[in-house]
C-alpha cells in the first residue's frame, strides 16, 4: 500500500514540478524611449524594456533587441506602435507618410527572417493641424520554436510614441505543440 | 486500502473543485448605448452590458462602470471602439479630431490610475464627405491583483458607435501569478 | 491494491487521453490571393489558407469559406485585414472609401448569422499620392458552440492585400463552457 | 501655427453695437472651431460664443444670447462678434481662440478646447 501510495504521490510530485518548471511563457515589452533610431526608413527597433513598469518576461529571454523563445508552443504575439508628431518638434520632412509595424521571426538554425504580421496606414499629416497621432495595432496565433527569436520593425522611427501604453509587444503562451 | 482509495479520490476531489471554483475568469463588456456620456473631452465610460448579446461575465465583477479583478492573475486586456458620425446628426464642431482610447488600472489599496494601454488617431472628418468611421483596437498582456479596477476612457463618446460589435472590451486569465 | 492501481492508474490514462483528444483547438487562416472577389460592395471571403506558410488548424474545420468549431467553449477570435492600392494599379472610382471588416458567427441550427466585431475606416485616398495602405484589427473573446460557424466580411475586397502576414483571422480556445 | 489678430473694439455708449474682427494666418482656418471670450477688468476670462468650422453652428454663453451674434467668413480667414445692445457689464477685453481635435460644439464653451489665442481688444461700454 505505502508503495503504491508513494506511487501516486510521485506522479503528483512529477505533475506538479514540470507544472511549476514549465510554467507558461510570456513577455510584455515597451519601448525604450531613451534610444529609438533616428530617420524615416524601415528599422528594427531593439531597445525594449522587460523588467519595469508594465514591462515583464518569464520563461523567455530578451537579448539584442529580441524576444527569444525558450519553449516551443503556440504562442499569441501582440503589437501596439503609436505615433505622434507636435508642430513644437518642426516641420516633417514630407506630409505624406507610411507609419508601419512589422513583427518578425527569425530562425537561428535556418538563417532567415519572416515577417508573421504587418499593419499600418498611409497618412497625410497636414501642416493644417498642430498635432497627429496613429496607432497601430497586430495579434496573431503562431507556432514558435526554441531559439526562434521575435523582433519589431518600423517606419518612420523618429515619430514613435514613447510612453509604455503606447508602444510595446508582448507573447503569451497558449498551448504546446501535439 | 479504502483509505489509500479515498485520499487518492479525495485528492482528485479538491482538484476538480478548485478547478471548478477558481475556473479562469473572463469578461467581454459592450457599450451601454442609452448611456453614453455627451461632451468631447477625454472621459470614463461607465455604462457597459454583462448579460446580453455577446456580453457576458464570469468570476469577475462589475460594478460602478468598472471591471472588477476578483482573481490574482495574468491577464490578456482588449479593447475595440468605433467612432461614426453622419452628416445628418449634424455638423461637427471641427474636422480636425482626436479619437482616442485609454484603459487604465484603478488600485483601490494605493488609490491611483495608471493607463495601461491606449490608441487612436488624429483624423480629419472633411465635410465634404456625408459619412465617417473609425476604429481602434488594443490589446495586451498584463499582471492584474484581486481589488483591481479596469476602466475605459475615450476622447468624443458622442461619436461612438453603439452596436455590440463596435465597442466592447474585455479580459481573460491566461495564468497565475508564479 | 492492484485494482486500486488500475482504477487510479486508469483514472490518469482518461485525463491523459481526454487532454490528448480534445487539445485545445485552434486556427490561423490566411488570405487565398488567387481567389479574391472584385468589386467594392461589402462581401464574404471565402479562400483561406489553413496549411501553408503561417496558416494552421487544429481540431476545427475549415470548410466552403467559413471555420467551423468542433469543440464547445470559449474562444479568442482576432482578424486582421489589409488594404492597399498603387497607382499602378490604374485610378480608384472613388476617393472616398470605406475599408471595413465584419467578423461573423453563423449558427447552423438556427440558421442566422450575427456580426461579432467589426472594425475599420472611411479613408480619402487621394490621386495626389502614389500609394495608400491601411490596416485593420479586431479581437474578442465569444462562447462558440460545436457547428458554428466564423466567417470575414470586407468591404472592398480588390483593394486587399494578398500577403499572409498581412491578410489573416484566427481563432484559439481559452478555456471551457462551465 | 494659428496667428490670430483681434480689431474693432473702442468706446460705445450703452446700447450702442460694436463689431468685433479676428483675422486668422497660417493655417486652414475653415477646419477649426472658433470662439469668443472675454476678461472683465479683476476677472476670470469667461465664455462668449462659440461656431463650428462651417458656421452652421453656434452656441452662446447665456449673459449674451439675443445681443450678440458670432459667425465667420471662411473665404476671407475671419471670424467676427456683432454686439448689439451694449451694457457697462459687457467692458472687457476680448479674446478669439482657435481650436480643434473635440466633436462637440459645447466643449467649446471651456478655455480648454482651445490652442491658439489672440492677444485681445478691449471692449469698454460707458456713458
Known amino acids: 500500500i505505502r508503495a503504491e501510495k508513494a506511487m501516486v504521490d510521485g506522479s503528483w510530485l512529477d505533475l506538479a514540478k514540470r507544472s511549476k518548471l514549465e510554467a507558461q511563457p510570456f513577455a510584455h515589452l515597451t519601448i525604450n524611449a531613451t534610444d529609438i533610431p533616428s530617420g524615416s526608413h524601415k528599422v528594427s527597433l531593439s531597445s525594449w524594456y522587460h523588467d519595469r513598469g508594465w514591462a515583464k518576461i518569464s520563461n523567455m529571454t530578451f537579448s539584442n533587441g529580441k524576444l527569444i523563445v525558450n519553449q516551443d508552443g503556440f504562442y499569441y504575439l501582440y503589437a501596439n506602435i503609436c505615433f505622434r508628431h507636435h508642430e513644437t518638434s518642426g516641420d516633417l520632412a514630407t506630409e505624406y507618410l507610411q507609419l508601419m509595424v512589422y513583427v518578425t521571426k527569425t530562425s537561428i538554425k535556418i538563417p532567415s527572417s519572416h515577417t508573421l504580421m504587418k499593419g499600418g496606414s498611409t497618412k497625410y499629416w497636414s501642416g493644417n493641424s498642430e498635432f497627429h497621432f496613429y496607432s497601430i495595432n497586430v495579434g496573431g496565433f503562431f507556432k514558435l520554436r526554441s531559439g526562434e527569436e521575435i523582433s519589431i520593425e518600423v517606419s518612420n522611427p523618429s515619430l514613435l510614441d514613447p510612453d509604455q501604453d503606447a508602444t510595446y509587444f508582448g507573447a503569451f503562451k497558449v498551448r504546446d505543440i501535439d | 486500502i479504502r483509505a489509500e482509495k479515498a485520499m487518492v479520490d479525495g485528492s482528485w476531489l479538491d482538484l476538480a473543485k478548485r478547478s471548478k471554483l477558481e475556473a479562469q475568469p473572463f469578461a467581454h463588456l459592450t457599450i451601454n448605448a442609452t448611456d453614453i456620456p455627451s461632451g468631447s473631452h477625454k472621459v470614463s465610460l461607465s455604462s457597459w452590458y454583462h448579460d446580453r448579446g455577446w456580453a457576458k461575465i464570469s468570476n469577475m465583477t462589475f460594478s460602478n462602470g468598472k471591471l472588477i479583478v476578483n482573481q490574482d492573475g495574468f491577464y490578456y486586456l482588449y479593447a475595440n471602439i468605433c467612432f461614426r458620425h453622419h452628416e445628418t446628426s449634424g455638423d461637427l464642431a471641427t474636422e480636425y479630431l482626436q479619437l482616442m482610447v485609454y484603459v487604465t488600472k484603478t488600485s483601490i489599496k494605493i488609490p491611483s490610475s495608471h493607463t495601461l494601454m491606449k490608441g487612436g488617431s488624429t483624423k480629419y472628418w472633411s465635410g465634404n464627405s456625408e459619412f465617417h468611421f473609425y476604429s481602434i483596437n488594443v490589446g495586451g498582456f498584463f499582471k492584474l491583483r484581486s481589488g483591481e479596477e479596469i476602466s475605459i476612457e475615450v476622447s468624443n463618446p458622442s461619436l461612438l458607435d453603439p452596436d455590440q460589435d463596435a465597442t466592447y472590451f474585455g479580459a481573460f486569465k491566461v495564468r497565475d501569478i508564479d | 491494491i492492484r485494482a486500486e492501481k488500475a482504477m487510479v492508474d486508469g483514472s490518469w490514462l482518461d485525463l491523459a487521453k481526454r487532454s490528448k483528444l480534445e487539445a485545445q483547438p485552434f486556427a490561423h487562416l490566411t488570405i487565398n490571393a488567387t481567389d479574391i472577389p472584385s468589386g467594392s460592395h461589402k462581401v464574404s471571403l471565402s479562400s483561406w489558407y489553413h496549411d501553408r506558410g503561417w496558416a494552421k488548424i487544429s481540431n476545427m474545420t475549415f470548410s466552403n469559406g467559413k471555420l467551423i468549431v468542433n469543440q464547445d467553449g470559449f474562444y479568442y477570435l482576432y482578424a486582421n485585414i489589409c488594404f492597399r492600392h498603387h497607382e499602378t494599379s490604374g485610378d480608384l472610382a472613388t476617393e472616398y472609401l470605406q475599408l471595413m471588416v465584419y467578423v461573423t458567427k453563423t449558427s447552423i441550427k438556427i440558421p442566422s448569422s450575427h456580426t461579432l466585431m467589426k472594425g475599420g475606416s472611411t479613408k480619402y485616398w487621394s490621386g495626389n499620392s502614389e500609394f495608400h495602405f491601411y490596416s485593420i484589427n479586431v479581437g474578442g473573446f465569444f462562447k462558440l458552440r460545436s457547428g458554428e460557424e466564423i466567417s470575414i466580411e470586407v468591404s472592398n475586397p480588390s483593394l486587399l492585400d494578398p500577403d499572409q502576414d498581412a491578410t489573416y483571422f484566427g481563432a484559439f480556445k481559452v478555456r471551457d463552457i462551465d | 501655427e494659428v496667428q490670430l489678430v483681434e480689431s474693432g473694439g473702442g468706446l460705445v455708449q450703452p446700447g450702442g453695437s460694436l463689431r468685433l474682427s479676428c483675422a486668422a494666418s497660417?493655417?486652414?482656418?475653415?477646419?477649426?472651431?472658433m470662439g469668443w471670450f472675454r476678461q472683465a477688468p479683476g476677472k476670470g476670462r469667461e465664455f462668449v460664443a462659440a461656431?463650428?468650422?462651417?458656421?452652421?453652428?453656434?452656441n452662446y454663453a447665456d449673459s449674451v444670447k439675443g445681443r450678440f451674434t458670432i459667425s465667420r467668413d471662411n473665404a476671407k480667414n475671419t471670424l467676427y462678434l456683432q454686439m448689439n445692445s451694449l451694457e457697462p457689464e459687457d467692458t472687457a477685453v476680448y479674446y478669439c481662440?482657435?481650436?480643434?481635435?473635440?466633436?462637440?460644439?459645447?466643449?467649446?464653451?471651456?478655455?480648454?478646447?482651445?490652442?491658439?489665442w489672440g492677444q485681445g481688444t478691449l471692449v469698454t461700454v460707458s456713458s
Open positions: 497660417g493655417r486652414t482656418f475653415r477646419s477649426y472651431a
Open positions: 481662440a482657435a481650436g480643434s481635435g473635440y466633436a462637440s460644439l459645447s466643449y467649446y464653451s471651456t478655455e480648454r478646447a482651445y490652442t491658439y
Open positions: 461656431i463650428n468650422y462651417s458656421g452652421g453652428s453656434t
